[in-house]
């Protein structure tokens, strides 16, 4: 029947449709128990079941928890909607070194290019600053406007960078000359970013708290709504989001309607035993220092690359950086780059760089 003529306000008496004056057309009346996926549904498939608060309906029609962006280093990029998770990204001044579903498992502060280097590409939420050698005759201290700016937060003195390796690294097969790859990381305590845009009260992402239309018996399009803090998993089951309430955990990504909350070890700790969407055991993370020079590289989700100093200048490890603050945690997928002997689990002297083996256990860099 005609749907675009304003005078068809009775929709030809079809009880399964109603006339929406705002859009001036006939719309499909969602059955009881279902919610429309758009302002003017046209067919049964435009109706859905209602999930619980902070849950979304995933592709398998299961209510799945939205991720949360409550960790200090994350901000909300897109809100939790009825059919998509909330999406988080690293807050300004930080980049994602380990990605996670709809979020970032680990954010690092953008590196400040050291003396003799200039900013080739400024850092983004996904990529760290990329440095390149300064041109001859240019003052290395202020080779580019970006390089003259103060960092968004304090950084560890360059002589004492925190050892990490990129989360995704083909570089793990690269030779290590006299030590580890080191990435500079801010050591100042994370300060809470300005509150991210809240999805509370947004009609666009309302999970379905509005009055509902009837759902007729025998309808195959009725979709369900999970409870708050549950998500609709791939199998279409409402599954509880993991909790990050343990003292040594922080929330990495929030509970969304179609994905679990994920947790990671709090700053200063590293995951020794991983668990689904979380970490079963967190251990303190050692801090190593070294005089380094920067090697430019341009790969997504990798920290600025540093080259270890010449042999004979192997760094010492300190319990914490000079300011006494611990670094951010490292996810189980991250480790220091080590040589072929790193697969052997050995006692860890306080002066030895540490990596995590595939089992999550620390291993010694035999160097």
């Amino acid at each position: 029947f005609p749907q675009d003529r304003p005078f068809e306000d009775t929709c030809h008496g079809n009880p399964s449709h109603y006339y929406d004056k705002a859009v001036r057309r006939c719309c499909y009346r969602c059955p009881m128990g279902l919610f429309p996926t758009q302002q003017c549904p046209q067919r049964p498939t435009d109706c859905r079941k209602q999930c619980e608060p902070d849950y979304y309906l995933d592709e398998a029609d299961r209510c799945t928890a939205c991720v949360t962006c409550s960790r200090d280093d994350l901000v909300e990029k897109t809100p939790c909607a009825w059919n998509s998770s909330r999406v988080c990204e690293c807050r300004p001044g930080m980049f994602c070194s380990t990605s996670a579903v709809n979020s970032c498992a680990r954010c690092f502060f953008h590196s400040v290019c050291p003396a003799g280097m200039i900013v080739k590409f400024p850092g983004t939420a996904q990529k760290n600053t990329v440095c390149e050698p300064a041109s001859p005759g240019v003052s290395p201290a202020c080779a580019s406007p970006e390089n003259c700016k103060e960092p968004s937060s304090g950084t560890i003195p360059q002589a004492k960078p925190t050892p990490v390796s990129p989360a995704t690294s083909s570089a793990s097969t690269m030779p290590v000359r006299g030590g580890t790859r080191l990435a500079q990381e801010a050591a100042s305590k994370l300060t809470r970013a300005p509150d991210s845009p809240s999805s509370v009260g947004r009609p666009s992402s309302d999970p379905g708290l509005s009055p509902t239309q009837p759902c007729p018996e025998g309808s195959g399009d009725c979709r369900k709504q999970c409870e708050p803090d549950y998500y609709l998993d791939e199998a279409g089951r409402c599954t509880a989001c993991v909790s990050c309430s343990r003292d040594d955990l922080v929330e990495k990504t929030p509970c969304a309607w179609n994905s679990s909350r994920t947790c990671e070890c709090r700053p200063g700790m590293i995951c020794a035993t991983s668990a689904t969407n979380s970490c079963a055991r967190c251990v303190p993370y050692p801090i190593c220092a070294a005089e380094t020079v920067t090697k430019p590289q341009d790969m997504a989700e990798k920290d600025t690359t540093f080259e270890a100093p010449p042999l004979g200048t192997q760094p010492d490890c300190n319990p914490t950086p000079e300011n006494g603050e611990a670094p951010a945690s490292t996810s189980p997928t991250q480790s220091l780059l080590v040589d072929s002997q790193a697969s052997k689990t050995l006692p860890i002297p306080t002066s030895a760089p540490v990596a995590l083996s595939s089992t999550g256990k620390p291993v010694l860099d035999a160097g």
């Epitope: 079941k49 029609d61 992402s205 309808s219 803090d229 089951r237």
Partner: antibody, heavy 119, light 111 residues
């Protein structure tokens, strides 16, 4: 008219199991979560869990995991709750209740099924 | 789990007067601009009956003398004027987190 009709009272032995039913009528059974609530004599209400008859999905109160098992039969529009390894602590009235979509309230309740565990 | 502390445990009110029942949650029940707080009335030998949903919305068919208010963690149910038919137990319930929990109940009596 929406109605939830529960099965009759049960007197059972400790250690045994019981399965109580809740037959729904007057609405699309598959499209609403069916909740189960426990009430001991003179006590408050405890939420046991819920099942979505459309696909058998369930949420449980952790306290009742292993104690209660929720199932549903779409063909007969009936929800079931089986209670196992019964003890005197399980003696109570059990209600089924339909959960509204939207505000999560339980708008229609069964009349309740009394379960008495006694040797 | 979220703990709901309901008070008072019992309340005696004269006919025509106001009855106020309080329910405090151990954490916020806010969700997308609404509070997932519910109120039920239960009479002896009967199942609970839904009175209020989303903290302040009166269920259809419920007399206008029942009203709910509050947000976040503090909520209240008001009955005014109280009638004889209101003698019952009143329970608050939260749906913000699984498991859903109920308050301990308030017994309303007539002075």
């Amino acid at each position: 008219e929406v109605q939830l009709q529960q099965s009759g009272a049960e007197l059972v032995r400790p250690g045994s199991s019981v399965k109580i039913s809740c037959k729904a009528s007057g609405y699309a059974f598959s499209s609403y979560w069916m909740n189960w609530v426990k009430q001991r004599p003179g006590q408050g209400l405890e939420w046991i869990g819920q099942i979505y008859p459309g696909d058998g999905d369930t949420n449980y109160n952790g306290k009742f995991k292993g104690k209660a098992t929720l199932t549903a039969d779409k063909s007969s529009s009936t929800a079931y709750m089986q209670l196992s390894s019964l003890t005197s602590e399980d003696s109570a009235v059990y209600f089924c209740a339909r959960r509204i979509n939207g505000n999560f309230a339980m708008d229609y309740w069964g009349q309740g099924t009394s379960v008495t565990v006694s040797s | 789990e979220i703990v709901l502390t309901q008070s008072p445990a019992s309340l005696a009110v004269s006919l025509g007067q106001r009855a106020t029942i309080s329910c405090r949650a151990s954490e916020s029940l806010e969700y997308y601009g609404t509070s997932l707080m519910l109120w039920y009335q239960q009479k002896p030998g009967q199942p609970p009956k839904l009175l209020i949903y989303s903290a302040s919305n009166v269920e259809s068919g419920v007399p206008a003398r029942f009203s709910g208010s509050g947000s976040g963690t503090d909520f209240s149910l008001n009955i005014h004027p109280v009638e004889e038919d209101d003698i019952a137990m009143y329970f608050c319930q939260q749906r913000r987190k699984v498991p859903s929990t109920f308050g301990g109940g308030t017994k309303l009596e007539i002075k």
